[in-house]
């Protein structure tokens, strides 16, 4: 951890590498002071998507994250964003380790390690820091695509990561185009995959206290279909009266089996977007349909709470496509003076 150059304030720590995910274990009651890079200007700290106030026990102040005395509820994900561009400068997870609050003099000092800040961190066997990014194990991708497998982990001492293919050490030397091992990102990247890349890819993460592993199964398809295509204008912006029934339509074209999700955009703690930049959504319906069918979302007896943005999300083994529409719900007495739908056109998006 590098020390800040700001001398007029109390020293603070800066996470090791910018734009790298990092996990820090903090003792209960310990003060935390973290810098957001080497400048104090134009940097804001967020916790779980909400910007930290500049005053209080936990505050984001002059580009610094300050916690007077670490409490269990302070654990979580913290982001430092550059104002304007909203670039993520630091992506940090703080974990609480209350074992540090009761260190007695007769403990074996080898079980603890200290950082340059003078804070003491316990040694810890490797663990997954973002298991939600490892939820999908079985992969099937078209030949020519780029494949990225990630096993984000942490531990103390900092663990090392090794990759195996079908149980054997894998360095990509026999692979045309080789591989990219990005140890800081705990990732393996293979570009332009071919059928000979099929297999089981295992990340082995280990330090002196233990090891963990996770396997991905990769199939390479010798064809190149496209992600789903959604018919323009569907779903359509709709205006309805309280108590009426509404149908939102989504017509999907896909040569690969499409899966459809209907999402409703929601607001959490006054925000429509999470710290990752993605909107907060509620999944209303998930279904598999046969190609070129119309998928319908039925909303019965709508109320004012049903108003808002709805998204039809279609995915297949190649990628995702989505389109959105707005539902306006009017009280019954308003029916006489407006029948217009909102001005905004449906949104059209395609994502790989």
């Amino acid at each position: 951890l590098e020390a800040s150059e700001e001398m007029e304030q109390e020293p603070c720590l800066a996470p090791i590498l910018e734009q790298q995910e990092q996990v820090l274990t903090v003792a209960l009651g310990q003060p935390v002071r973290l810098c957001c890079g080497r400048t104090e200007r134009g940097r804001h700290w967020y916790k779980e998507g909400s910007r930290l106030a500049s005053a209080g026990r936990v505050r984001g102040w002059r580009g610094r994250l300050e916690i007077a005395s670490f409490l269990p509820e302070d654990a979580g994900r913290y982001l430092c964003l550059a104002r304007g561009s909203m670039t993520v400068v630091h992506n940090l997870t703080l974990l609480m380790d209350d074992s540090l609050t009761s260190i007695s003099n007769d403990e074996d000092p080898k079980t603890l390690s200290s950082s340059s800040s003078g804070h003491v961190y316990p040694q810890q066997a490797p663990y997954w820091t973002h298991p939600q990014r490892m939820e999908k194990k079985l992969h099937a991708v078209p030949a020519g695509n780029t494949v990225k497998f990630r096993c984000p982990a942490a531990g103390n001492p900092m663990p090392t990561i090794h990759w195996l293919k079908d149980g054997q050490a894998f360095h990509g030397e026999n692979r045309i185009g080789g591989i990219r091992l990005r140890h800081q990102h705990w990732s393996l990247v293979m570009e332009s995959v071919v059928p000979s890349d099929r297999g089981t890819y295992t990340c082995l993460v280990e330090n002196s206290l233990g090891s963990i592993r996770y396997s991905y199964l990769l199939d390479v398809l010798e064809r190149s279909p496209h992600r789903p295509i959604l018919q323009a204008g569907l779903p359509a912006n709709t205006t309805a009266v309280v108590g009426s029934d509404v149908e939102l339509l989504c017509k999907v074209y896909s040569d690969a089996q499409p899966h459809i999700q209907w999402l409703k955009h929601v607001v959490i703690n006054g925000s429509s977007f999470g710290a990752d930049g993605f909107p907060y959504v509620q999944v209303l319906k998930t279904t598999d349909i046969n190609s070129s069918e119309v998928e319908v979302l039925y909303l019965r007896n709508v109320s004012a709470e049903d108003a808002g943005e709805y998204t039809c999300l279609a995915g297949n083994s190649i990628g995702l496509s989505y389109q959105s529409a707005w539902l306006t719900v009017l009280p019954e007495e308003d029916l006489t003076w407006t029948t217009a739908t909102p001005e905004a056109a449906s949104h059209h998006h395609h994502h790989h």
Epitope: E135, K136, P195, T200, R213, A256, N316
Partner: antibody, heavy 120, light 112 residues
Framework: EVQLLESGGGLVQPGGSLRLSCAAS????????MGWVRQAPGKGLEWVSV????????IYADSVKGRFTISRDNSKNTLYLQMNSLRAEDTAVYYC?????????????WGQGTMVTVSS | QYELTQPPSASGTPGQRVTISCSGS????????VHWYQQLPGTAPKLLIY???QRPSGVPDRFSVSKSGSSASLAISGLQSEDEADYYC????????????FGTGTKVTVLG
């Protein structure tokens, strides 16, 4: 309607062979990982094998490795399990199942099963 | 054969809450998503719930799951007679090679 229909079960002597089939309908078979799961009479579920969409990647439980072969014919929407050197402990109902990425790689669709009895 | 351990049986009266535990290791539940299956008497298993309380359509929200470390549990609140079935947890396992493993199974009986 999404459906899986197994066939090919029956009575076979120890050391004998049998080939099970699973006909898929109602979904694009060639885009799914598929597997076999078995259940001995009065016992729990045991995973047997899985095959990738292209058929190019197969994985087996240790208990059947070297004796069973999973395969598929995407043009016929059919999954197969070739069982050789059968033993009494292979007696079970064999289920064909689909693994779905949207169900986080769980087996989301199952067939009704076909009974395999290994006995002399 | 079984890497995941479940209690053989659980029971409750209608309306009660029943919980089934599923114990594994770091190579299966500790690193992988847990799936739960329900098998009604004389029928094929069906996917009941997976991941972070995600359910196939038609599965009531009386069923919920939790996971901590290398263990998981399935809770059935407001037990109903139609919940009488065998329940299996399952997970992919990465110990030496990837494979899929089921729990030993739990028979849920609705009393009265």
């Amino acid at each position: 309607e999404v459906q899986l229909l197994e066939s090919g079960g029956g009575l076979v002597q120890p050391g004998g062979s049998l080939r099970l089939s699973c006909a898929a309908s109602g979904f694009t078979f060639s885009h799914y990982w598929m597997g076999w799961v078995r259940q001995a009479p009065g016992k729990g579920l045991e995973w047997v094998s899985v095959i990738s969409p292209s058929g190019g990647l197969t994985i087996y439980a240790d208990s059947v490795k070297g004796r069973f072969t999973i395969s598929r014919d995407n043009s016929k929407n059919t999954l197969y399990l070739q069982m050789n050197s059968l033993r009494a402990e292979d007696t079970a109902v064999y289920y064909c199942a689909r693994s779905s990425g949207w169900a986080l790689d769980a087996f989301d669709i199952w067939g009704q099963g076909t009974m395999v009895t290994v006995s002399s | 054969q079984y890497e995941l351990t479940q209690p053989p049986s659980a029971s409750g009266t209608p309306g009660q809450r029943v919980t089934i535990s599923c114990s594994g290791s770091s190579s299966n539940i500790g690193s992988n998503i847990v799936h739960w299956y329900q098998q009604l008497p004389g029928t094929a298993p069906k996917l009941l719930i997976y991941g972070n309380n995600q359910r196939p359509s038609g599965v009531p929200d009386r069923f919920s799951v939790s996971k901590s470390g290398s263990s998981a549990s399935l809770a059935i609140s407001g037990l109903q007679s139609e919940d009488e079935a065998d329940y299996y947890c399952a997970s992919w396992d990465d110990s030496l090679k990837a494979f899929y493993v089921f729990g030993t199974g739990t028979k849920v009986t609705v009393l009265g």
